[in-house]
């Protein structure tokens, strides 16, 4: 139902929404306040829970910290004495806020706490090689919650330059697909930046000595990255893919990649890193298939088959809305959602999943919609569907409120209606009302007036009147009632006279040059305010000031100096306020015999 | 069906340690908390530990604490209780249950328990 | 801790009879008091949560109602099956706690 804007003074209360909560994912830092967001609209007054892995997590209660819980909000911030503090925070939390009418819950919140990074202390070996051959300088950067930037620099902090020859993997390993004695370094040292922590760390120095030789052989290329032949991956649509070969050989190696499947989408691919790595920006479904790289130098060549699956995370075809239904009503809500692999779809009520609710209850599911019938106050609740597949959670709180409203008639009381016999008169009564009052037109004896053919009502509670007569004039009495109350009003019909042509204008031939005068006479309600106009092929008549073509008066039509233009249709037009009559004559203008 | 089933009950004098289990089916185990309640025999239902569904919060029974350790293997499904320095008071039957948490928080199944004996 | 006391710790009573059990917080808890039914030999079993609502598979004749610190469990119309040992349990904050017990006996 939706609660017309004319009925004042309903219902106060409000289910609990949900109306800002924290990302699913949270990386706090060493230094960060631990700020959780929840906050929820509802009437009578909501009151908020957390859980955090699967028990209810009370933050006033967190020993050696300082919690600040904001008034009338779930939302609260934990700051710690230690810069280790938030380790002791991490997991999944999730909000439930709650009033009488049910509870709304939060999407899972994962708190991940970031530590200082640090490289494990470790031995780094020189790493000797002979010139021309391949090498591999690893960079293995510490695991971090956020994406890094790594960089490979030498101790004068001025950056290795890449090339075809030389190039930075994706995982952050150095790869010579072949090296030169100009190679020959003691630091070769890895850079990762941890955006969040405004932190760069670095790797123990690499020395690479690369031994000269006389005789540089020839090699065909070989595949540092990936090494095998064909490898499996799933990209996630509307998401970047990024596909990367890098290859060694002598002389170096160059990079082409092909798509077996069908046409590379050129306007979103973008090649870089000397053409080692293949991006495509926003993954299709069409995107699906394989991707090839082939290696080539004058020695040979080395391929590697990327097969590609286009999977994507849930999203919504239909979200279920929260509404308002009457008691008895039948209340559905849609949760149409779509993915691959295809989503799992879970209901809750008020937080709770179904499966664990009595099996008693009357709601049902069907297609992926959760219906109630015949819902009572009762009923009212906050309802929850959750998909989610391996790619990831969607989460929709939508409420069933059951409302009982007594009825109201929203037309005025005590309204006059006029209109002339023979025609329909029709008498307003909208009602409103939880459960949907019935509507009954009455008489003034109380008498159903249904039993006379003429009377006939419509949905909305107007009461139609076909083929008036004189003695429907009178007082009629519309009844609203529900379930809580009945409220009547007053309706006042006057039925008038209709107005009536008792002579219409005649036909006629005239001579051009000629006048010829129309007349027209009506007989109209005498309380009526009586109106005779003229009309000429349908548009209307008037003396024109500056013209003496045309002269009316009581209900005279004269036409002056007759003209071919002005052979036609004229008519005359009787009317009050409530009805409109018509007389049409045909005007035929000839010309005198010719000489 | 939802499952769960204690074992490694038995006699055992009183110092001395035994660990129990609870295998869990029927349900996603590593979403819920878990929970030992034990009823002495003759006696009431007396709480003593929670875990939470990933091992980050556990709590404890004051008569308990630092004796008990209770952990769980969410890749095995299973629920554990290592009861050290054990007391003629700990004997009980000892039951598992599944806590649901929402904005309200419930042991909604229960193992069939084991019987524990403390005795010389 | 939070103290749970039940009253009566026993009951005769007859089939069909109203039977209600009490129990006390020593603390407001809200409304999160669970029942649990237990029969001799066997594991306890969830009734009602969060002080009213039914639990699922449990006959409609059990009912619970109170918030803040006092409660009840009403039986409408006594059972020969409903014979057995009920308590009330808080779960408010830890340590969770229940209340000692009342044994409903035949008459």
């Known amino acids: 139902i939706q609660i017309p804007e004319e009925y004042e003074g309903h219902h106060v209360m409000e289910p609990p929404v949900i109306t800002e909560q924290s990302p699913r994912r949270l990386v706090v830092f060493p230094t960060d306040d631990i700020s959780l967001k929840c906050e929820a609209s509802g009437k009578p007054e909501v009151q908020f829970r957390w859980t955090r892995d699967g028990v209810h997590f009370k933050p006033k209660e967190e020993l050696g910290v300082t919690v600040y819980q904001s008034p009338h909000s779930g939302s609260f911030t934990i700051t710690g004495n230690n810069s280790n503090f938030a380790q002791r925070f991490q997991g999944i939390y999730r909000c439930f806020a709650s009033n009488k009418l049910g509870t709304a819950m939060s999407h899972e919140i994962r708190l991940m706490a970031e530590g200082a990074p640090k490289w494990p202390k470790e031995t780094v070996k020189p790493v000797e090689v002979e010139e021309g051959e391949s090498v591999v300088l690893p960079c293995n950067p510490p695991p971090s919650a956020e994406p890094l930037r790594i960089y490979w620099m030498n101790s004068k902090i001025l950056h290795i330059k890449q090339d075809e020859r030389v190039t930075m993997g994706q995982n952050g390993n150095l790869y010579f697909a072949n090296v030169l004695t100009s190679d020959n370094h003691s630091d070769y040292i890895c850079h990762a930046h941890f955006p969040g922590t405004r932190t760069i760390i670095q790797k123990e120095p690499i020395d690479l000595r690369v031994k000269a030789t006389n005789s540089m052989i020839d090699r065909k290329p070989r595949l540092l990255f990936p090494t095998n032949s064909s490898s499996h991956l799933v990209a996630l649509q509307g998401q970047p893919l990024v596909l990367e070969c890098i290859a060694e050989g002598f002389p170096t190696p160059t990079i082409k990649w092909l798509r077996p499947s069908g046409p590379m989408p050129a306007d979103r691919v973008t090649y870089q890193n000397h053409n080692k790595t293949l991006q495509l920006l926003k993954v299709g479904e069409e995107d699906d298939g394989e991707y090839r790289c082939l290696a080539e130098n004058s020695l040979g060549s080395a391929r590697h088959a990327y097969y590609v699956t286009v999977e994507a995370a849930p999203y919504w075809l239909h979200k279920p809305q929260s509404h308002l239904y009457g008691p008895g009503e039948t209340a559905r809500l849609d949760c149409q959602v779509q993915g691959r692999p295809q989503p799992e779809v879970t209901w809750r009520i008020n937080g709770i999943p179904v499966e664990e609710l009595a099996k008693d209850q009357k709601y049902r599911i069907q297609r992926g919609a959760l219906i109630l019938s015949n819902v009572q106050p009762s009923d009212t609740m906050v309802t929850q569907c959750e998909a989610r597949n391996r790619h990831g959670l969607l989460l929709a709180n939508a409420y069933i409120y059951v409302v009982q409203l007594p009825a109201k008639i929203l037309t005025a009381d005590n309204q006059t209606y006029m209109a002339v016999q023979g025609s329909t008169a029709y008498l307003l009564c909208k009602a409103f009302g939880a459960p949907v009052p019935s509507v009954q037109w009455l008489d003034e004896d109380g008498t159903t007036v249904l039993q006379d053919e003429r009377f006939f009502p419509y949905a909305n509670g107007t009461l139609g009147i076909r083929d008036l007569q004189a003695n429907d004039t009178g007082r009629y009495f519309c009844l609203a009632a529900n379930d809580q109350n009945n409220v009547t009003i007053m309706a006042n019909l006057k039925v008038k006279d209709a107005t009536q042509i008792t002579q219409g204008p005649r036909s006629t031939i005239e001579k051009k040059g000629s006048r010829v005068t129309f007349t027209c006479q009506a007989s109209f309600d005498p309380s009526l305010q009586p109106s005779i106009t003229w009309r000429g092929d349908g548009r209307d008549l008037q003396e024109l000031g500056d013209s003496d073509k045309y002269f009316i008066e009581d209900g005279r039509l004269v036409i002056h100096s007759l003209d071919y233009s002005d052979q036609g249709n004229y008519s005359c037009v009787a009317s009050t306020e409530l009805d409109v009559v018509e007389s049409r004559a045909q005007l035929l203008v000839v010309g005198s015999p010719g000489p | 069906e939802v499952q769960l089933v204690e074992s490694g009950g038995g006699l055992v004098q009183p110092g001395g340690s035994l660990r129990l289990s609870c295998a869990a089916s029927g349900f996603t185990f590593s979403d819920y908390a878990m929970n030992w309640v034990r009823q002495a025999p003759g006696k009431g239902l007396e709480w003593v530990s929670a875990?939470?569904?990933?091992?980050?919060?556990?709590y404890y029974a004051d008569s308990v604490k630092g004796r008990f350790t209770i952990s769980r293997d969410n890749s095995k499904n299973t629920l554990y209780l290592q009861m050290n320095s054990l007391r003629a008071e700990d004997t009980a039957v000892y039951y598992c249950?599944?806590?649901?948490?929402?904005?309200?928080?419930?042991?909604?199944?229960w193992g069939q328990g084991t019987l524990v004996t403390v005795s010389s | 801790d939070i103290q749970m006391t039940q009253s009566p710790s026993s009951l005769s009573a007859s089939v069909g009879d109203r039977v209600t059990i009490t129990c006390r917080a020593s603390q407001s808890i809200s409304r999160d008091l669970n029942w649990y039914q237990q029969k001799p030999g066997k594991a306890p079993k969830l009734l009602i949560y969060?002080?009213?609502s039914l639990q699922s598979g449990v006959p409609s004749r059990f009912s619970g109602s109170g918030s803040g610190t006092d409660f009840t469990l009403t039986i409408s119309s006594l059972q020969p099956e409903d014979f057995a040992t009920y308590y009330c349990?808080?779960?408010?904050?830890?340590?969770?706690?229940f209340g000692q017990g009342t044994k409903v006996e035949i008459k």
């Open positions: 875990i939470s569904s990933t091992g980050s919060t556990i």
């Open positions: 349990q808080q779960s408010y904050s830890t340590p969770y706690t």
């Open positions: 249950a599944k806590q649901s948490t929402y904005f309200y928080s419930y042991f909604d199944v």
């Open positions: 969060a002080a009213s």
